[in-house]
């Protein structure tokens, strides 16, 4: 079946911004939003925050939980601001994202 | 070793449609965004658009809207290029190439694939 | 769509010499850009990401700097292989776009 290919421009989203990538700000906008949680020299790593390229969230959301990282999305105005990533109980480890560009 | 393997070169009639592989090896496209590259000879890059084969989303740049349909099945680990309505500035060598969150940019090219139309 | 301004079109080079290329962007990207080395009958080969980055393999002479709308790429120390085109590409924005390309050849 062909695409239907729609010509629109992305829908943004606002989201809660926590975390040192955020500055002074409490929220930010892009096309999707996020809730991380990441293990870093033993600590216990939670942000939050937002995608401006689009792609960039699509990638990142479908790398699966590891040990030391999981990810959670959502698309909608401030939908991660009830969410909370979890690392898996389990499982292998993987080499997840580690060049996130968020500004 | 990661590596993506295109479909031989095509010789098609104006009018006509051509559809392009590429086959991955090395990692599975269902962990990355397969993407599609013009170059006209002596010429610079056009891109195309994606396809994330996990679940068919598709992108496109305006101007292929009409033109490139880019499909994938997972199945064979193959992405497809099908250009319709084919003309002489359609001569090109198209490249695929793949993005995933390593570099968040494309990472690995095929070898390109040339198609020339002409009656 | 995001216009991608490289320049020059064209240099010529002595092996050990340094080169430097721009790419403007016609509005912010902040450092959503990539450098492709393409050699003649072969595909682009990633170079630098994150518009500073080095991809795995990439040899040091090769580096990136910039970010919003000005970027460059320095070859310092140029080696015989290095004599190809140069492509700048953004990635902030669909359509994603190249530069018109800088073709580096030997002097």
């Known amino acids: 079946m062909e695409d239907e290919k729609p010509k629109v421009n992305p829908k943004l989203y606002m989201c809660v911004c926590e975390g040192l990538s955020c500055g002074n700000e409490d929220h930010c906008e892009g096309q999707q939003c996020f809730s991380s949680l990441s293990i870093n020299d033993g600590f216990h790593v939670y942000q939050k925050g937002c995608f401006q390229v689009y792609e960039q969230g699509k990638m990142t959301c479908k790398t699966p939980p590891s040990p030391g990282q999981a990810v959670e999305c959502c698309q909608g105005d401030w939908c991660n601001r009830n969410i909370t990533a979890q690392l898996p109980t389990k499982g292998k480890s993987f080499p997840g994202t580690q060049n996130f560009h968020l500004e | 070793e990661v590596q993506l393997q295109q479909s031989g070169a095509e010789l098609v009639r104006p009018g006509a449609s051509v559809r392009l592989s590429c086959t991955a090896s090395?990692?599975?496209?269902?962990?990355?965004?397969m993407h599609w590259v013009k170059q006209r000879p002596e010429q610079g890059l056009e891109w195309i658009g994606w396809?994330?084969?996990?679940?068919?989303?598709?992108k496109y740049a305006p101007n292929f809207q009409d033109k490139a349909t880019i499909t994938a099945v997972t199945s064979s680990n193959t992405a497809y290029l099908q250009l319709s309505s084919l003309t002489s500035e359609d001569s090109a060598i198209y490249y695929c190439a793949r993005y995933t969150s390593d570099y968040y940019t494309m990472d690995y090219w095929g070898q390109g694939t040339s198609v020339t139309v002409s009656s | 769509d995001i216009q991608m301004t490289q320049s020059p079109a064209s240099q010529s080079a002595s092996l050990g010499e340094s080169v430097t290329f721009t790419c403007l962007a016609s509005q912010t990207i902040g450092t959503w850009l990539a450098w492709y080395q393409q050699k003649p009958g072969k595909s682009p080969q990633l170079l630098i990401y994150a518009a500073t980055s080095l991809a795995d393999g990439v040899p040091s002479r090769f580096s990136g700097s910039g970010s919003g709308t000005k970027f460059s790429f320095k070859i310092s120390s140029l080696q015989a292989e290095d004599f190809a085109s140069y492509y700048c590409?953004?990635?902030?924005?669909?359509?994603?776009?190249f530069g018109g390309g800088t073709k580096l050849e030997i002097k």
């Open positions: 396809i994330d084969p996990e679940d068919g989303e598709t």
């Open positions: 590409q953004q990635l902030y924005s669909t359509p994603w776009t």
């Open positions: 090395g990692f599975n496209i269902k962990d990355s965004l």
